[in-house]
């Protein structure tokens, strides 16, 4: 759809005569009839297939025609058409004399014709005004013409309909060739697809309006590029939704079992060295001067009985001092001035001379030690009790008092709640510090795997449109991760497919 515009510019009829040569009385009151039709190989009489238009009387004999377009007048003349502009045409312009006010063809004598032109033309849409001049022996007509498209029509022949819009069916304006130009923030064939927030993950995020980033199930974060870990995951991460990949030092289904108690809780005090010895268990190796399960107790330096051969220990600010009995000397009374002749071995120890009688050594009976068998053996000095057990001297023997959850001579054994096979249906039993936990096989759940459940929520392939299915282990349900272009709990709904022709 478009308009053929004809601008009459000047008509010259100096002698004021009709086509017959007869003069007009008093002058030629001139109006024009225009006929526009399809291109003819030879211009021939026939219907004005593209339209006709007439002017009022524009002047007498010779005159220039005013451009009246701005004032809503009739120059340029408008010949609208409702078809694809073919690019070529035939144009006939007749100049007539109006003796009276009635300009209808039937009201005029046939010899009222002043002049007639008939041309074949070629004209592209949107071309600049094309100027032409037709001269005869008596008259001259100057005119120009062009073709423009009607509102909402575009292209080389005004055949492309395009109406700007900003609604559910599209967000665009029209380019000169009729192609759509999307408004900022929109894309797609009909500009119906919003451009999401920059960086919004292509698969895991979507948007319903520009600069938005809405996350699909299982994803979170401003750009939907962070997966949501399994519900209840304590010390773990994920690379795909609903995973729980444990951080270092943690274990269990929810990464809530502490495998690195030393690092997470630093239980050993006073610079002691901590060693992990199992789930939530550890051993502290104390620095000299400290004792206790966590090396929390400070020892007097004399507590370690550093003075030998019956020397007595005196605490001092900067350490300790040994007062040696007669016949001994040295920092710890370790050097003897005695010989076997002086019966230096106590508690039934037997004396053996060394270095030709210059020195001696005592061989002590059980439960006694020291260079003179003067000390009762403390069987706890080697800290034999594992898993934080407390060592107690009981006469000639020793005993370990174990922490809860441990047993055995040296507290080396976990008290196993799993020994009585409490997990039903082939469940795997895990000892915990305060109880046990069953890991159930597929199809069973409950604290002891006693409840029969569906084998796998994803087994029935509930997700549509090639979505990825994840089983939510905590609820035995499934979650569908939709591919681009689909939404819904099962990815069953396409996102706003454009209709074939929105207008």
């Amino acid at each position: 759809s478009g308009v053929f515009q004809l601008q009459l510019q000047e008509f010259i009829n100096e002698r004021g005569v009709l086509a017959s040569g007869r003069p007009c009385e008093p002058g030629c009151r001139t109006f024009f009839r225009v006929c526009l039709k399809h291109f003819q190989a030879v211009v021939s009489p026939g219907p004005c297939t593209f339209g006709t238009v007439s002017t009022p009387v524009l002047g007498t004999n010779s005159f220039a025609v005013r451009d009246d377009s701005s004032g809503g007048g009739r120059n340029p003349l408008q010949l609208p058409f409702n078809f694809t502009w073919p690019g070529t045409f035939s144009l006939i312009i007749e100049a007539w004399h109006a003796p009276g006010d009635d300009l209808r063809p039937e009201a005029l004598p046939p010899d009222a014709l002043i002049s007639k032109i008939a041309i074949q033309g070629s004209l592209a849409v949107g071309q600049n005004w094309l100027l032409d001049e037709q001269t005869s022996t008596l008259t001259r007509l100057r005119y120009s013409y062009r073709v423009i498209c009607s509102d909402n029509y575009y292209g080389d022949n005004c055949s492309r309909l395009c109406k700007k819009r900003n609604d559910h069916f599209g967000h665009y304006v029209c380019q000169p060739d009729g192609n759509l130009s999307c408004l900022p923030g929109w894309t797609g064939e009909y500009c119906q697809q919003p451009i999401c927030l920059s960086g919004c993950h292509e698969q895991n995020g979507y948007c319903s309006k520009p600069a938005e980033c809405l996350c699909r199930p299982g994803w979170q974060g401003r750009l939907c590029n962070e997966c949501i870990p399994h519900n209840g995951c304590r010390h773990g991460t994920c690379s795909t939704p609903w995973q729980c990949t444990c951080d270092e030092g943690w274990g269990g289904l929810f990464c809530d079992q502490d495998l690195n108690y030393c690092t997470h809780h630093s239980p050993c005090k006073n610079g002691a060295t901590c060693s992990n010895s199992g789930q939530r268990s550890y051993t502290c190796t104390c620095r000299p001067g400290y004792t206790g399960v966590d090396c929390e107790l400070e020892l007097s330096e004399c507590d370690s009985n550093p003075c030998r051969n019956g020397g007595s220990c005196k605490d001092q600010e900067d350490g300790y001092h040994c007062l040696c009995p007669p016949g001994y000397y040295g920092l710890h009374c370790e050097h003897s001035t005695l010989s076997c002749a002086d019966s230096p071995c106590f508690n039934g120890g037997s004396c053996r001379e060394r270095n030709q009688g210059a020195n001696y050594a005592c061989e002590c009976p059980p439960n006694f030690t020291g260079s003179n068998c003067e000390k009762k053996v403390d069987r706890c000095t080697s800290n034999p009790c594992a898993n934080g057990g407390q060592c107690l001297n009981r006469g000639p023997s020793r005993m370990c008092r174990c922490r809860p959850g441990f047993t055995g001579t040296y507290c080396e054994l976990h008290v196993s709640d799993c020994a009585r096979n409490p997990c039903a249906h082939g469940g795997t039993c895990h000892d915990l510090e305060n109880g046990l936990m069953c890991t159930c096989p597929a199809g069973f759940s409950g604290r002891r795997c006693e409840v029969r459940t569906s084998i796998d929520a994803c087994a029935s392939s509930p997700c549509f449109n090639r979505a990825t299915c994840y089983t939510d282990l905590s609820t035995d349900t499934f979650v569908c991760n939709c591919p681009y272009g689909f939404v819904g709990s099962r990815c069953e709904f396409p996102v706003g497919l454009p209709p074939s022709f929105p207008w």
Epitope: Q40, A41, V42, V43, S44, P45, G46, T88, S90, I92, K116, I117, A118, I119, Q120, G121, S122, D132, Q134, T135, S136, T137
Partner: antibody, heavy 118, light 107 residues
Amino acid sequence: EVQLVESGGGVVQPGRSLRLSCAASGFTFSNYGMYWVRQAPGKGLEWVAFISHGGGITYYRDSVKGRFTISRDNSKNTLYLQMNSLRAEDTAVYYCAALNWELGIDYWGQGTMVTVSS
Amino acid sequence: DIQMTQSPSSLSASVGDRVTITCRASEDIYSNLAWYQQKPGKAPKLLIYAANRLQDGVPSRFSGSGSGTDFTLTISSLQPEDFATYYCLQGSKFPLTFGQGTKLEIK
């Protein structure tokens, strides 16, 4: 008096060129589309080429397309037909004509003979 | 291309006879058809244009009729000067095409 006078015809060898002219007088040459029509000896009429009044539109019959060129000089009231790569089948009397039946115009020249022969 | 089929190709008639020549177009050409008369060694002369309009100066014994695809030239009463070859020409679309001609001879 309306006159169209063709010139430039003659005998020419195949593959050679000729330029025909048509001088117009007695009417406003620049107002009308112009045509070349030919007639082989003993045969019927055959249209050859067309040019619109301002020279902006040209058409040719398929057999001469790319070999013949129609042009006009409105300041000299003259129509031309440049004929290249001539063939034996181009042998004919060539007429120029001004045709506009809407205006009752139908002017023809007397014709010029073109013979293509080795 | 539009084909123009003219008939008959030749015709013998006498002075005073009524003669009809027909032309058929291969597609609709509306009324865009002309009839020409040509005598040996002369240029064609326009008789009828727009299917039925008589050209200025042509005797009224010549008339044309038809539209669309079928057209007729009628000479109501043959005169000695009418013995010639007659052609139809369609002016609707390029390429312009003529009928093959009808040679009118004295019986």
